[in-house]
């Protein structure tokens, strides 16, 4: 008789990830961002959908809005007026572009528990917000701005020239929303609600992108969007400010544009209120290497805004474009004139500087061969910021506090040693005056959100620790992840490798490169994720690698600006270099290497497949850019200049995917695009397909009808299932 076979019980119950797990979002995590309403209070939507106020000092919770009230108007969002008298409830959410949406708004009176009747808001509204003090309302309806002194009052119409696709007041047009402001709004209240500043975008002369939306009707609709492609006519922007106490007195007053900006095509990049009577505007030349920060003051006698030349601060890049992805915004100190700002130091690393009078005399606050990434808050005695300084890993984020009240200023890492293995990538959210703050850790372990005392940094409580996720993952064979670097020809290539659970260095594995690679992006980050590539490693036994090459962010200007005016060259070279290094490691089956990417990553993966190296057996491009002449002016020209003979037309032409059509002959190529992509137009893939057909090159393709750049909903499931089949076929893996 044989004794029964003893199984390792742990291994026996462990299972690999399935594609279904990923598509169902089985292993998604939660974060907790308090909706701060004071120094010690925040609002949060409870599991049962009540809006609950939590007072940190008393430790007590209070329901301020019941789930029944929310449900009575099908509200999916809310906003409390600063005087706590009213809440707006948002329903009928209808997405437009990346940030923009329209909605129906109801105002609920918290003092009597009833909805405000009379002078109801029109629908649908494009944007609505409370004043920072009291309960004034500003909103945008049909591209015009309206003001209410109280929710029940009749509205005062501020602008009258708003017109669909022509004039946008208080909201950005497509290109400003996507590539400059990264918001759905273009209006800003002054700190006490005295003034309201807003942008007017004139798109009258902008060429229109038109595409079919098939819907269910007999005839497709045509979507028309004023969309300036590289070199095309751009929107014309003006900034106005109106006194909201007496809006009819002098009406909106235009803020003057600095002379050195106004002399040629320009952009408005951001507005920051300093006090109720001082505002800071940032402007950018169309050739985006010169930015001007202009501080303007209200002149009571003339009821106008004055922007003296002495309060203009110029930021210029001689090696690339101004700023990182965007030009950074200032954080003003309590004297209401000096400010803190992140820009490149003399060594080419983005660092915090303190500007008191001129940029030339700026005092550098942080320094080193790493980068300051975000300034969260400046108080009387502390400045909180994030950086990737700790242990020299560019893909980490820790939160630091610099004491600015004492000299010399002392620096403390708030997060570096909190949960060292679990947490290496943080963001933070601060209450008024930084009395308390929440830390949100994104990984590499399971994300956790915690509440801290702003004075002592002491942890007060755990807000969200994802216990259910932790339990659910106990019987899952997750892949192993490692973040390392390759040193190649004076360039450091950081990579993340995702390895199958039972990885054995002596075996050979298929390799999939996931690439984005766009300017100022970063893919190699110490964050937690259970996603499609996790499944490919866990279940299908692939090795997946992500590589940050030239053009990527947070490692200094040398790497970042290497791609300036030359997109599509070094990003591709660096992916190829990394693949060669991976092959040298000995565990990659060099006959089974694939590359895939989305958007900019689709562009890079396409160029890598068409590089003629013979390294890649197959690859996928989802919604790729195929020619920089087809993409948005603001983004493209930042990195490429203009597509004119006397500027950079030659490289625009040389860097297309179509120019390399012949080189796809020896690879398996899957091209995917949504037909209603407002961002990277279907035109890009249509032109690739046409070039491949004309070159008589076989390829595979999938379109997603009426889907945009995100390929969401049921399309997501179809997409990942389709790509999985493609890769498994390419790698000769059985289904």
């Amino acid at each position: 008789l044989r004794p029964p076979r003893v199984h390792n019980s742990e291994e026996n119950t462990m299972r690999a990830l399935t594609l279904k797990d990923i598509l169902n979002g089985t292993f998604s995590y939660k974060t907790f961002f308090p909706n701060w309403i004071s120094g010690q209070e925040y609002l949060h939507q409870s599991a049962d959908n009540n809006i609950v106020l939590y007072n940190i000092e008393t430790g007590q919770s209070y329901t301020i809005l019941s789930n029944r009230t929310m449900k009575s108007v099908n509200a999916s969002n809310y906003g409390l007026s600063p005087d706590r008298q009213f809440v707006y409830l948002e329903s009928d959410y209808s997405k437009l572009w990346r940030y923009s949406y329209t909605a129906t708004y109801y105002i609920y009176d918290l003092s009597n528990g009833e909805f405000v009747r009379g002078n109801e808001l029109p629908r649908p509204i494009q944007y609505l917000c409370w004043s920072p003090v009291g309960s004034k309302l500003a909103y945008v309806y049909q591209n015009n701005i309206y003001l209410k002194q109280r929710p029940g009052d009749p509205p005062f119409q501020i602008t009258f020239n708003g017109r669909e696709n022509k004039i946008f007041n208080g909201i950005p047009d497509w290109v400003y929303e996507e590539e400059m402001l990264a918001t759905k709004y273009a209006l800003w209240w002054s700190p006490n609600g005295k003034f309201l500043a807003y942008a007017e975008f004139n798109d009258t002369d902008i060429p229109v992108i038109a595409y079919s939306y098939y819907g269910d009707e007999q005839y497709p609709r045509t979507i028309n969007i004023p969309y300036p492609k590289a070199g095309a006519k751009n929107p014309f922007v003006r900034i106005f400010i109106i006194d909201t106490t007496y809006p009819a007195y002098v009406g909106p007053q235009e803020v003057p544009v600095p002379a050195m900006i106004a002399s040629s095509d320009y952009y408005f990049s951001w507005l920051t209120w300093v006090t109720d009577e001082r505002v800071c505007l940032q402007w950018l030349k169309r050739v985006q290497n010169v930015s001007v920060l202009s501080i303007c003051d209200f002149r009571e006698d003339w009821q106008t805004w004055d922007c003296p030349k002495t309060q203009e601060h110029i930021e210029e890049s001689r090696t690339g474009w101004a700023g990182g992805f965007f030009v950074s915004t200032p954080v003003f100190s309590y004297d209401a004139i000096s400010y803190y700002k992140i820009f490149s130091d003399k060594d080419g690393y983005k660092h915090i500087h303190y500007i008191k009078d001129t940029v030339e005399n700026a005092i550098q606050i942080t320094s080193g061969k790493w980068e300051a990434i975000n300034i969260f808050r400046v108080t009387q005695d502390s400045l909180f910021y994030s950086s990737n300084e700790f242990e020299d890993y560019p893909g980490r984020r820790n939160i630091y506090r610099i004491s600015i009240g004492s000299y010399p200023p002392s620096k403390k890492c708030v997060t570096c040693h909190l949960r060292k293995e679990r947490c290496q990538y943080y963001t933070a959210s601060f209450s008024d005056y930084a009395k308390y703050y929440a830390l949100v850790c994104y990984g590499p372990g399971i994300p956790i959100s915690t509440l801290h005392d702003g004075r002592t940094d002491q942890e007060i409580k755990i807000l969200e620790e994802n216990k259910e996720l932790e339990n659910a993952l106990k019987n899952i064979q997750l892949p192993k992840e490692e973040i390392k670097k390759l040193e190649v020809d004076e360039i450091t290539l950081w990579y993340k490798m995702i390895l199958p659970p039972q990885f054995d260095r002596s075996k050979k594995y298929p390799l999939l490169i996931q690439v984005y690679g766009g300017p100022c992006s970063q893919s190699v980050r110490s964050v937690f994720a259970v996603n499609w590539i996790s499944y490919l490693a866990s279940k299908e036994g692939m090795v997946i690698a992500l590589v940050d090459g030239r053009g990527t962010a947070f490692q200094g200007d040398k790497l970042l600006y290497a791609v300036y005016r030359k997109l599509g060259v070094y990003e591709v070279e660096d992916q190829i270099t990394a693949v060669r290094k991976f092959i040298e490691m000995g565990f990659i089956d060099e006959k089974r290497i694939a590359i895939w990417g989305w958007s900019y990553g689709g562009y890079v993966s396409s160029l890598a497949l068409a590089s003629g190296t013979g390294l890649f057996k197959c690859g996928i491009a989802v919604a790729p850019v195929s020619s920089w002449e087809y993409y948005a002016s603001v983004y493209t020209e930042r990195f490429m200049g203009l597509p004119t003979k006397d500027d950079n037309l030659e490289h625009y032409k040389n860097s297309t995917v179509m120019a390399r059509a012949e080189y796809f002959r020896n690879v398996d190529y899957l091209l995917i695009h949504g037909t209603a992509d407002d961002n990277v137009h279907f035109q890009n893939s249509a032109q690739i397909a046409k070039a491949l057909v004309n070159a008589q090159v076989d390829f595979q393709a999938m379109w997603y009808s009426d889907q945009n750049h995100g390929l969401s909903g049921l399309s997501t499931n179809h997409l990942y299932t389709h790509m999985t089949h493609f890769l498994k076929q390419c790698f000769s893996l059985s289904d």
């Epitope: 004071s38 120094g39 010690q40 209070y62």
Partner: antibody
Framework: EVLLQQSGPELVKPGASVKIACKAS????????MDWVRQSHGKSLEWIGD????????IYNQKFKGKATLTIDKSSSTAYMDLRSLTSEDTAVYYC????????????WGQGTSVTVSS | DIVLTQSPVSLAVSLGQRATISCRAS??????????INWFQQKPGQPPKLLIY???NRGSGVPARFSGSGSGTDFSLNIHPMEEDDTAMYFC?????????FGGGTNLEIK
């Protein structure tokens, strides 16, 4: 109409305990916290504590910790306050009040329950 | 604990005239632009009734002749014009800090 109906007057001996009930009607009990206040004869008002009905989470005036215990019975829409180790000093009228958290205001009050501690 | 001192302790005002009751806190009760000072009216044998919350907001059904103002440590309740029905005890109360505390009360009557 919002109504907080409190239980009747109590006459108890020193050292004894008493449980005062407060039945809420005209609104949903779980939508507001319930606070308790006492008023000794001819004196001002003293805040005892607060309960969050959804979880039963409480906060107390330090002075009443160990003296008062606040609870909620959601099924009957009733809040309770237990008072123990009573002395003559605890002779007072005890009120339950609906607490509107967003404004930190006691907006509706029960009619009061008179507690007399006497041997 | 925050101590609230009301003055005067008692006050007699003619019908139609203005009654002003003051409330001084031992420390600031301002909370980031808001002051959680409430005022109550209590008539004999009745529970207190909320008149004013958050310094200056009238409770539901409270007539416009009642108004509140103040910030920091000094607050006041105004009644104008005084009516017969306003004879009562008035209490201020702070909810800025636990334990919530009440003033000693002001007895208002008709002159």
């Amino acid at each position: 109409e919002v109504l907080l109906q409190q239980s009747g007057p109590e006459l108890v001996k020193p050292g004894a305990s008493v449980k005062i009930a407060c039945k809420a009607s005209g609104y949903t009990l779980t939508d507001y916290n319930m606070d308790w206040v006492r008023q000794s004869h001819g004196k001002s008002l003293e805040w005892i504590g607060d309960i969050y009905p959804n979880t039963g989470g409480t906060i107390y005036n330090q002075k009443f910790k160990g003296k008062a215990t606040l609870t909620i019975d959601k099924s009957s829409s009733t809040a309770y306050m237990d008072l123990r180790s009573l002395t003559s000093e605890d002779t007072a009228v005890y009120y339950c009040t609906r607490f509107r958290g967003i404004h930190y205001a006691m907006d509706y009050w029960g009619q009061g329950t008179s507690v007399t501690v006497s041997s | 604990d925050i101590v609230l001192t009301q003055s005067p302790v008692s006050l007699a005002v003619s019908l139609g005239q203005r009654a002003t009751i003051s409330c001084r806190a031992s420390e600031s009760v301002d909370n980031y632009g808001l002051s959680f000072i409430n005022w109550f009216q209590q008539k004999p044998g009745q529970p207190p009734k909320l008149l004013i919350y958050g310094t200056s907001n009238r409770g539901s059904g409270v007539p416009a002749r009642f108004s509140g103002s103040g910030s920091g440590t000094d607050f006041s309740l105004n009644i104008h014009p005084m009516e017969e029905d306003d004879t009562a005890m008035y209490f201020c109360q702070q909810s800025n800090e636990v334990p919530y505390t009440f003033g000693g009360g002001t007895n208002l009557e008709i002159k």
